[in-house]
């Protein structure tokens, strides 16, 4: 018996050869003996089958002796044995349909977890063979599960179900909601314009949810809210924003926050939570500021950075086209009796210069000038 | 019987894009998986890339800047792209198809051999 | 990435022989690992698939078996044709190759 596979939703075409090369009477039946259709002459006539509707044949083949049976838009329950009757015999075809599909939806929240379900016949014993997009292989039965979704999860699934040595293959586009980003730092001068800027990775028609920024400060001893809004078709609404400080943001994607002034005070990490309309679950993406400060005091020129530095990071004090005269992995430094001239303060991570902050030092009679 | 065949240059000039196409005969391109292997001359075997039933593609992330992958399903054809060659690049490369998506290649090309030299 | 090894680069064996060639895995590849044969005029073969189903044609002398980062190729009895040089490769993600046991005739 010959076995084919089909596909839910798909088109099959079960073939039936005769011997003689020309038109003559065939029929197919199903395993109950109910007739699906046959000829009459140059006619195709059709029996009482619930395939009725959606199976057809390819007149144009029959007088090469081939008389197909074409069954569109398969289900699952279509699964059965189809029996083609020509010249006295009997060709016997079983048809396994599949269906493969991700639960529930197809945009799924960074960390979610994507389940697919295979539908098969009862009686079958498929396993399935699915790749991610980034080329890892899972496999599985019935259902096929991948927990913590990663952005790189995002595309095109590709799936083979195999039984009997004997193959269907799936395609399932999945969409992985995320920031593009989990996590970014921005470095300014004290005093400096600070941009927040949160990417999304994707791209949906209409976009529509709440958000808020929540700001734990270095100095300060819990977090709290800066700002709350309303996200709808992808424009961007100010719901509540604190008084200090006064946060702008954004009114179109991607979601852009502008913080006038930094200063040590703001210094510190945020988070900020994106609820999606009809998602459980939110998207976060932190964010962090760190502050630098260089200031001259009497004969004490230090520099200073306020927020979340790696201890790798190093901090120097030099005068411009000179050796570092001080440099730490510390968050302060200072150097006494600075010589007159224009002073570096330097905050770098493997040499790369992160952040960099100039002061002018006048001959001690002279007030210091920033430039 | 499903039988690859890979052709074009045997000798390609350092810099240049080497280009390879594998023609697939006893199956359609527009079902399994179909990858390129090369061999280096002391038999390390790399795997370079695939492209899929789906259209989709993956490569090798060492080669990611410099590769590309394509298809034509009216010839029944896969091609290979490998931009800004070296010396290093010279291999026997094989094209091959994986049927049930294991990466486990069931049928190879006899290779061809590509020299990168001035 | 995942790295898998080959321990042994050659190995000498006598015709009726039972041959075992292993190969690791730098983590679980949850029996994704393929074995294949090159013979000495460049002819590649898939030989064993997903640690140990038979591909079509392939005799059953070579057998396969392993789980999570260990696996090994049998060859039940060494016959004349076998003399090649065996690769195992993962593809639990995108595939890596063992550096190659060259098996020749004692």
């Known amino acids: 018996k010959k076995v084919v596979l089909g596909k839910k939703g798909d088109t099959v075409e079960l073939t039936c050869t005769a011997s003689q090369k020309k038109s003559i009477q065939f029929h197919w039946k199903n395993s109950n003996q109910i007739k699906i259709l046959g000829n009459q002459g140059s006619f195709l006539t059709k029996g009482p089958s619930k395939l009725n509707d959606r199976a057809d044949s390819r007149r144009s083949l029959w007088d090469q002796g081939n008389f197909p049976l074409i069954i569109k838009n398969l289900k699952i329950e279509d699964s059965d044995t189809y029996i083609c009757e020509v010249e006295d015999q009997k060709e016997e075809v079983q048809l396994l349909v599949f269906g493969l599909t991700a639960n529930s939806d197809t945009h799924l929240l960074q960390g979610q977890s994507l389940t697919l379900t295979l539908e098969s016949p009862p009686g079958s014993s498929p396993s399935v063979q699915c790749r991610s997009p980034r080329g890892k292989n899972i496999q599985g039965g019935k259902t096929l599960s991948v927990s913590q979704l990663e952005l790189q999860d995002s595309g095109t699934w590709t799936c083979t179900v195999l039984q009997n040595q004997k193959k269907v293959e799936f395609k399932i586009d999945i969409v992985v909601l995320a920031f593009q980003k989990a996590s970014s730092i921005v470095y300014k001068k004290e005093g400096e314009q600070v941009e927040f800027s949160f990417p999304l990775a994707f791209t949906v028609e209409k976009l529509t949810g709440s958000g808020e920024l929540w700001w734990q400060a270095e100095r300060a001893s819990s977090s709290k809210s800066w700002i709350t809004f309303d996200l709808k078709n992808k424009e961007v609404s100010v719901k509540r924003v604190t008084q200090d400080p006064k946060l702008q943001m954004g009114k179109k994607l991607p979601l852009h926050l502008t913080l006038p002034q930094a200063l040590p005070q703001y210094a510190g990490s945020g988070n900020l939570t994106l609820a999606l309309e009809a998602k459980t679950g939110k998207l976060h993406q932190e964010v962090n500021l760190v502050v630098m400060r260089a200031t001259q005091l009497q004969k004490n020129l230090t520099c200073e950075v306020w927020g979340p530095t790696s201890p790798k990071l190093m901090l120097s004090l030099k005068l411009e086209n000179k050796e570092a005269k001080v440099s730490k992995r510390e968050k302060a430094v200072w150097v006494l009796n600075p010589e007159a001239g224009m002073w570096q303060c330097l905050l770098s991570d493997s040499g790369q210069v992160l952040l960099e902050s100039n002061i002018k030092v006048l001959p001690t009679w002279s007030t210091p000038v920033q430039p | 019987e499903v039988q690859l065949e890979e052709s074009g240059p045997s000798l390609v000039k350092p810099s240049q894009t080497l280009s390879l196409t594998c023609s697939v005969t006893?199956?359609?391109?527009?079902?399994?998986?179909w990858n390129w292997i090369r061999k280096f001359p002391g038999h390390k075997l790399e795997f370079l890339g695939y492209i899929s039933f789906a259209d989709t593609t993956n490569y090798n992330p060492s080669l990611k800047s410099r590769i590309s992958i394509t298809r034509d399903t009216s010839k029944n054809q896969f091609d290979l792209q490998l931009k800004s060659v070296t010396t290093e690049d010279t291999a026997t490369y094989y094209c091959?198809?994986?049927?049930?998506?294991?990466?486990?290649?069931?049928?190879w090309g006899q290779g061809i051999s590509v020299t990168v030299s001035s | 990435d995942i790295y898998v090894t080959q321990t042994t680069s050659s190995l000498s064996a006598s015709l009726g022989d039972r041959v075992t060639i292993i190969c690791r895995a730098s983590q679980d590849i949850n029996n994704y690992l393929n074995w294949y044969q090159l013979k000495p005029d460049g002819t590649l073969k898939l030989l064993i698939y997903y640690t140990s189903r038979l591909h079509s044609g392939v005799p059953s002398r070579f057998g396969g078996s392993g789980s999570g980062t260990e696996y090994s190729l049998t060859i039940s009895n060494l016959e004349q044709e076998d003399v090649a040089t065996y690769f195992c490769q993962q593809g639990n993600t995108l595939p890596t190759f063992g550096a190659g046991t060259k098996l020749e005739l004692k």
């Open positions: 091959a198809r994986d049927d049930f998506g294991y990466y486990a290649m069931d049928y």
């Open positions: 006893g199956d359609s391109i527009t079902s399994s998986y």
